[in-house]
């Protein structure tokens, strides 16, 4: 069908509450494009009707609410005038009863669910709520160990919980709750957050921390398009450079002629005491020569690599 396949990271989600995923792939989605979502390679798109539990809303796919059976691979097809890209997003839904069990036991939780407060400092936690414009979010309530947080040391400011004079007792399981209104119906959003306490001033000292990748291999089919994010936390006042290298050369220089592998534009999210940086590497077409090579993400003195490997043959197909 002429669409290039791009494989994105997995998303691990909680059942019985709203979830939305935005299909954005700069620079493709910055121009005049149409975005259509499909589920598990279905021939017909995800519903366009806003009253449907799962429907598409412009570039978003919206689940109101997410259900256990919604796990699977969703494709978002981005069609431009002269291009077509199919982005694969693997959604895994788990049953989460946040009062019953520790959120720490869940696999591969993103940075949004694990946050750090700095001992003796004024700090904050962030409630990550990503939804399209058609969703209206009410005020956020915060809980610790299932009890609503009250007290002079805590202030709710938009999506943040400000914590003054952080103490060791502030570690533990938090949750932020908001009421989401869509098309006249109300839904509860509840995000669990595991909070740890650090004594270090600043965010992990002056050495940047590479959250992802983690020196691992990625299975990828020959000929596909692949995007890998490098996520780095660093102090707000840092002067570190972040980049992707191969054979100790910047990827943009190494592939200067073919431009087949490129480094993306760096973005960052600013937190109270640190920044979270993201810079991706895009393989427009994976070739045999890419397998087994360490592609290194550098952030100051920190490094982490990915190695591409061919998927093991699936003998069930024969």
């Amino acid at each position: 069908d002429g669409c290039k396949d791009i494989f994105m990271k997995n998303e691990i989600l909680s059942a019985s509450q709203p979830f939305a995923f935005n299909c954005t792939f700069p620079p493709i989605t910055s121009g005049e494009v149409s975005v259509t979502w499909y589920k598990n390679s279905s021939k017909i798109p995800v519903s366009k009707i806003i009253q449907s539990r799962i429907h598409q809303d412009e570039t978003w796919i919206l689940f109101l609410p997410m259900e256990w059976g919604d796990s699977g691979v969703y494709q978002c097809v981005i069609k431009g005038r002269d291009s077509c890209h199919r982005i694969h997003v693997n959604l895994t839904v788990f049953e989460k009863h946040w009062c019953d069990t520790s959120i720490g036991g869940l696999p591969n939780l993103s940075d949004e669910y694990k946050q750090i407060l700095h001992l003796g400092k004024d700090d904050s936690l962030t409630c990550h709520l990503h939804f399209p414009k058609s969703c209206v979010l009410g005020p956020i309530k915060w809980y610790k160990d299932c009890n609503e947080i009250k007290g002079e040391r805590f202030t709710v400011l938009e999506t943040r919980l400000l914590v003054s004079n952080v103490s060791a007792e502030d570690r533990g399981n938090y949750a932020c709750q908001a009421i989401l209104t869509h098309s006249g119906k109300q839904y509860e959003v509840l995000n669990g957050i595991t909070v740890s306490i650090t004594e270090r001033a600043g965010y992990g000292g002056s050495v940047p921390k590479i959250i992802y990748p983690k020196n691992h291999s990625i299975e990828v089919q020959l000929g596909t398009t692949l995007i890998v994010d490098c996520n780095v936390t660093d102090t707000k006042d840092n002067t570190n450079l972040r980049c992707w290298r191969v054979n100790n050369t910047l990827v943009d220089d190494y592939y200067d002629e073919s431009k087949r592998i490129r480094e993306g534009v760096e973005t960052h999210v600013s937190f109270r005491e640190h920044n979270l940086y993201t810079v991706n590497i895009t393989f427009l077409e994976v070739k045999m020569e890419d397998y087994g090579l360490p592609f290194m993400c550098h952030a100051g003195v920190s490094t982490a690599y990915i190695i591409l490997q061919l998927p093991a043959p699936d003998f069930r197909a024969y």
Epitope: I44, P45, S47, K48, I49, S52
Partner: antibody, heavy 113, light 107 residues
Framework: EVQLVESGGGLVQPGGSLRLSCAAS????????MSWVRQAPGKGLEWVSG????????YYGDFVKGRFTISRDNSKNTLYLQMNSLRGEDTAAYFC??????WGQGTLVTVSS | DIQMTQSPSTLSASEGDRVTITCRAS??????LAWYQQKPGKAPRLLIY???ILGDGVPSRFSGSGSGTEFTLTISSLQPDDFATYYC?????????FGQGTKVEIK
């Protein structure tokens, strides 16, 4: 390929009943809300009724409330419209619709004595 | 219920003309509006949804605009295949309503 095949239309006397069916294939039936839309001869489109993917929510146009019942059997990939107390003004082609995009060919209901 | 008022009810035009059909909602429906094309004896075909997004396989000469209560469907250069009846449709609530239709005929 998506297919929607309506059946059950025909000639019925005023006050009578009919049950329309819409057999669907080519997609995951339970993932989609479905609707019935009708069109009287030479007239415009008129929405009749809608139902959510799991069948839990049903919706009706004012003119059919209490007379028509929409339902679905997700195990059979079939949508139904039970029409009671039929009137002359219910004479129309009835289309089964998935989402906004996919329409059946329609089944003609004629209410006449 | 939300009433949809379409105008004009009939439009005479020639091949190559730029044609505009308007649709007004009795209350705000945000951008939850679709446009359909219907030919005699056939089921309607989706042209535009969410007020301005082109349906699958729909030629780029069709475009939609508007939000709230005022919407337009534009055919930039009328082709022989475009002579048909056009309907607007609001799906802001699941009490759907359609406009009364605009018949585009050959002048």
């Amino acid at each position: 390929e998506v297919q929607l095949v309506e059946s059950g239309g025909g000639l019925v006397q005023p006050g009578g009943s009919l049950r329309l069916s819409c057999a669907a294939s080519g997609f995951t039936f339970s993932d989609y809300a479905m609707s019935w839309v009708r069109q009287a001869p030479g007239k415009g489109l008129e929405w009749v009724s809608g139902i959510s993917g799991n069948g839990g929510d049903t919706y009706y146009g004012d003119f059919v409330k209490g007379r028509f019942t929409i339902s679905r059997d997700n195990s059979k990939n079939t949508l139904y419209l039970q029409m009671n107390s039929l009137r002359g003004e219910d004479t129309a082609a009835y289309f089964c619709v998935i989402d906004l995009d996919y329409w059946g060919q329609g089944t003609l209901v004629t209410v006449s004595s | 219920d939300i009433q949809m008022t379409q105008s004009p009810s009939t439009l005479s035009a020639s091949e190559g003309d730029r044609v505009t059909i308007t649709c007004r909602a009795s209350q705000s429906i945000s951008s939850w509006l679709a446009w359909y094309q219907q030919k005699p004896g056939k089921a309607p075909r989706l042209l535009i949804y969410k007020a301005s997004i082109l349906g699958d396989g729909v030629p780029s000469r069709f475009s939609g605009s508007g939000s709230g209560t005022e919407f337009t469907l534009t055919i930039s250069s009328l082709q022989p295949d475009d002579f048909a009846t056009y309907y607007c449709h609001q799906y802001n609530s699941y009490l759907w309503t359609f406009g009364q239709g605009t018949k585009v005929e050959i002048k």
